[in-house]
């Protein structure tokens, strides 16, 4: 595609190339043959993040605490506010417009990946040799106790939800 009649950071209006407004500023009036483009800084709680010809700045996102949101990064005249979720919660979408409680991994499942402000807990089934007997958003699958290292024997086999039960070895008399 060949270049257009106006260069980068310019726009075509009424047969002339006008300068775009820089990020953080909005358009007040287009240039004319005799005057430059007139731009004004965005107001408090407003932003524009690109070179633009917008006549209105965008409002900063509001991180609504009623939805479990808090400010992760305060907005500037050139950037939007970034919201994240309160501790123990995570965003329901990439835009982080609301939060939900982190999922807990049920007994028989352990935490593969702990939840963050933007991702939920990832659980995995406990494989043979491992168990989880609690519902938790933090606990991994624990390995069964090794009875042998304690000079004990397995009295009750472990499952994905229970540890093995060790007991004393039967002594030959």
């Amino acid at each position: 595609e060949p270049p257009t009649a106006c260069r980068e950071k310019q726009y075509l209006i009424n047969s002339q190339c006008c300068s775009l407004c820089q990020p953080g500023q909005k358009l007040v009036s287009d240039c004319t043959e005799f005057t430059e483009t007139e731009c004004l800084p965005c107001g408090e709680s407003e932003f524009l993040d690109t070179w633009n010809r917008e006549t209105h700045c965008h409002q900063h996102k509001y991180c609504d605490p009623n939805l479990g949101l808090r400010v992760q990064q305060k907005g500037t005249s050139e950037t939007d506010t970034i919201c994240t979720c309160e501790e123990g919660w995570h965003c329901t979408s990439e835009a982080c417009e609301s939060c939900v409680l982190h999922r807990s991994c049920s007994p028989g499942f352990g935490v593969k990946q702990i939840a963050t402000g933007v991702s939920d807990t990832i659980c995995e089934p406990c494989p043979v040799g491992f168990f989880s007997n609690v519902s938790s958003a933090f606990e991994k699958c624990h390995p069964w106790t090794s009875c042998e290292t304690k000079d004990l024997v397995v009295q009750q086999a472990g499952t994905n939800k229970t540890d093995v039960v060790c007991g004393p070895q039967d002594r030959l008399r």
Epitope: P2, P3, T4, A5, C6, R7, L12, I13, N14, S15, Q16, C17, D30, T32, E33
Partner: antibody, heavy 116, light 107 residues
Framework: QVQLVQSGAEVKKPGSSVKVSCKAS????????IEWVRQAPGQGLEWIGV????????NYNEKFKGRATLTADKSTSTAYMELSSLRSEDTAVYFC?????????WGQGTLVTVSS | DIQMTQSPSSLSASVGDRVTITCRAS??????LNWYQQKPGKAVKLLIS???RLHSGVPSRFSGSGSGTDYTLTISSLQPEDFATYFC?????????FGQGTKVEIK
């Protein structure tokens, strides 16, 4: 004073091409856009495209994309409009105009007649 | 494309008359509206740019007004040299488009 002088009238066969020139004087050629417009007999004005003579950037009316080619020669302060695959409906007066808050100055027009 | 509807398509008037030509755009063109005068065998002339800005050398009897979609060209006192065809043109959005023209004739 600003002047745009266009090349003379042309008679062309259907399917051929025509190249109209527009020589500018009286201002900085690279400081203003050059617009191209046509007017069929008894009709209104129709925009073809615009070129920035400073670096050759162009915008075309979708209707003429692929058929119209706008170019500019800085050394001679001349803009060109070439129209290919001519048909009888392309019979019109073709104008160049200098930009700057509207089409500020116009050439005298070039009559292109397409006839077999 | 933005459609430009000009009215009337022709009018008859006498020298000294006040003449008004209107132009309506199919959408808001933010005052990027220009007016041109065309006479047979003469180069087209820009009269008014950006709704109301008189082009250099154009007599002050010509004026323009309007906003949004509706615009007006007024000739306060028609002179013999004003008998011509007048076109409006929007410069807000590509492709640039023109009204169909208004022919001002001698009554």
């Amino acid at each position: 004073q600003v002047q745009l002088v266009q090349s003379g009238a042309e008679v062309k066969k259907p399917g051929s091409s025509v190249k109209v020139s527009c020589k500018a004087s009286g201002y900085g050629f690279t400081n203003y856009l050059i617009e191209w417009v046509r007017q069929a007999p008894g009709q209104g004005l129709e925009w073809i495209g615009v070129i920035n003579p400073g670096y050759g950037g162009v915008n075309y009316n979708e209707k003429f994309k692929g058929r119209a080619t706008l170019t500019a020669d800085k050394s001679t302060s001349t803009a060109y409009m070439e129209l290919s695959s001519l048909r009888s409906e392309d019979t019109a007066v073709y104008f160049c105009a200098r930009g700057g808050s509207g089409f500020a100055f116009w050439g005298q027009g070039t009559l292109v007649t397409v006839s077999s | 494309d933005i459609q430009m509807t000009q009215s009337p398509s022709s009018l008859s008037a006498s020298v000294g008359d006040r003449v008004t030509i209107t132009c309506r755009a199919s959408q808001d063109i933010s005052n990027h509206l220009n007016w041109y005068q065309q006479k047979p065998g003469k180069a087209v002339k820009l009269l008014i740019s950006s709704t109301s800005r008189l082009h250099s050398g154009v007599p002050s009897r010509f004026s323009g007004s309007g906003s949004g979609t509706d615009y007006t060209l007024t000739i306060s006192s028609l002179q013999p040299e004003d008998f011509a065809t007048y076109f409006c043109q929007q410069g807000n959005t590509l492709p640039w488009t023109f009204g169909q023209g208004t022919k001002v004739e001698i009554k």
